[in-house]
């Protein structure tokens, strides 16, 4: 069964996404699995379905259970399961393990802490941040968009960080909190203007029509963990996600490698079932950090099948 764990606190908003994908135009039906009872779509209900999202506004402990979402997609309806647990608010400061999102690590050069699940909510900046239940104050802490930046990170900055924000639904406000641990790695390093190791500038890559092709964008940025370093691919100057060709995908996440002590990143562009029109596109490998951006361009050419006849 394709399921996903979600959790929240009573009297807070909780929004859960159906773990099965679908286009925005697809209808999604939600059911409470234990009773097979349909979740209403009317927003006047405290718990209601809104397309791919299931909204608890606010959540109650009794809402805990498994919810089924059925994406009414062409060919086959796709079924997913959301395992929802709503906990009572703790009276003391400790956040139990079962309420914690994944731990993130940082160093002096890289200290971003993202607020978990925030992209599901209708919120407005600024976020409020707390460490071990204390509101963060001082110039070292900067709430930027959906993450917290800590300047000059020290080992004492390790701990549990909670983000708090307000979700707005039809003029009504609901509080949301999410907590994750932050650990500090002691690292001495430096950063450089990005150096792209692959592909070579203006490289021509031979591909075969109908086969799969991979392009790797690889760049180094300095030594140690880097703050704001990234590599990515663009198609005709457009982000892959915005280009809208599902056959062409960036590999999820960036692989970090350390070559001769240098911090390097690579991003693989996968082209499934290469088509003639792919040869007309410009493929840009971009590497960027605080020093700037470097771009190497690749074009595809058709690999001529080997002539076996003499």
């Amino acid at each position: 069964k394709f399921s996903k764990q979600s959790w929240g606190l009573e009297n807070e908003a909780l929004i859960v996404r159906c773990p099965r994908q679908g286009k925005p135009s697809y209808t999604v039906d939600w059911y409470y699995s234990q009773t097979n009872k349909s979740i209403p779509t009317q927003e006047r209900n405290r718990v209601f379905a809104s397309g791919q999202l299931l909204k608890f506004l606010p959540a109650a402990v009794a809402d805990s259970g498994i919810y089924t979402c059925i994406v009414r997609s062409p060919t086959f309806n796709r079924t997913g399961y959301a395992n929802v647990t709503i906990y009572k608010k703790q009276s003391d400061c400790n956040v139990p393990d079962y309420l914690m999102y994944s731990t993130v690590s940082g160093s002096e050069k890289n200290s971003k802490i993202y607020c978990p699940t925030i992209d599901l909510y209708n919120w407005t900046a600024p976020l409020e941040w707390f460490k071990n239940c204390q509101a963060l104050q001082g110039s070292r802490y900067r709430a930027h968009k959906s993450f917290l930046v800590i300047d000059n990170v020290m080992t004492e900055d390790a701990g549990d960080y909670t983000c708090k924000f307000i979700h707005n639904e039809n003029g009504a406000n609901y509080s949301v909190t999410a907590t994750r641990s932050f650990t500090v790695k002691d690292e001495q390093g430096f950063s450089l203007f990005p150096v792209i190791g692959a592909p070579a500038q203006n490289e021509i890559k031979e591909v075969e029509i109908g086969k799969n092709a991979n392009l790797t964008c690889s760049a180094c940025f300095g030594k140690g963990t880097q703050f704001l370093a990234a590599v990515l691919w663009q198609l005709n100057g457009t982000k892959i996600t915005d280009f809208g060709e599902p056959r062409i995908q960036q590999e999820e996440g960036q692989n970090q490698s350390f070559s001769n002590g240098l911090a390097c990143l690579d991003m693989v562009l996968r082209i499934a079932d290469v088509k003639e029109e792919d040869l007309l596109l410009q493929y840009d490998c971009l590497a960027l950090n605080l020093h700037g951006l470097r771009r190497h361009t690749v074009r595809l050419s058709r690999k001529n099948p080997i002539d076996h006849h003499s």
């Epitope: 099965r20 697809y26 060919t75 796709r78 599902p246 499934a272």
Partner: antibody, heavy 120, light 111 residues
Amino acid sequence: EVQLVESGGGWVQPGGSLRLSCAASGFTFSSYDMYWVRQATGKGLEWVSGIDTVGDTYYPDSVKGRFTISRENAKNSVYLQMNTLRAGDTAVYYCVRGIYGDFYYYGLDVWGHGTTVTVS
Amino acid sequence: DIVMTQSPLSLPVTPGEPASISCRSSQSLLYSDGNNYLDWYLQKPGQSPHLLIYLGSNRASGVPDRFSGSGSGTDFTLKISRVEADDVGVYYCMQALQTLTFGGGTKVEIK
């Protein structure tokens, strides 16, 4: 090269079982729905089973409860376990590539050469 | 279940001349994403079927531009602008809106 190769066909008596295999190569197998489509001699095409990227399975009423489709992404393979076979199941069985990434539809764009199942 | 009906059953053609095959579905194949979930396949003698047209009118990779698909809702047409000898075989329409069902096929042969 993108290809699908079926195996496991053969002759079986009514009420018997057979397991068909399909080996995929040349594409990211785990990102695609996979289907089995059959064709009796001199007849048209009939869809008999499907499996999506997370392993959920789909069948027409004609084979439900008798046929089981499964996949092994690590081996780039899809299987069709056929039980309680009937004379009407005699056909060439094709392994077919379907929907990409849950909802990108490009038609059934890759077909195997088929494997023959005879029930008599 | 959606029923697919093709006509004609058999179509004798002359090379260089146009040809047309009709396919009708028992319910609309137009989905909310704006696509018609109707494909066309050709099965040449002794071969596996292969895809010609998907989502009503999109030519599959490597398919010559003399093949075109049109129609919406319940009525669809496959046209061959100039038939070639290599185009003989059985043509199938298939709906992919609710599971998969094929039409009975149209056999195209040279006169």
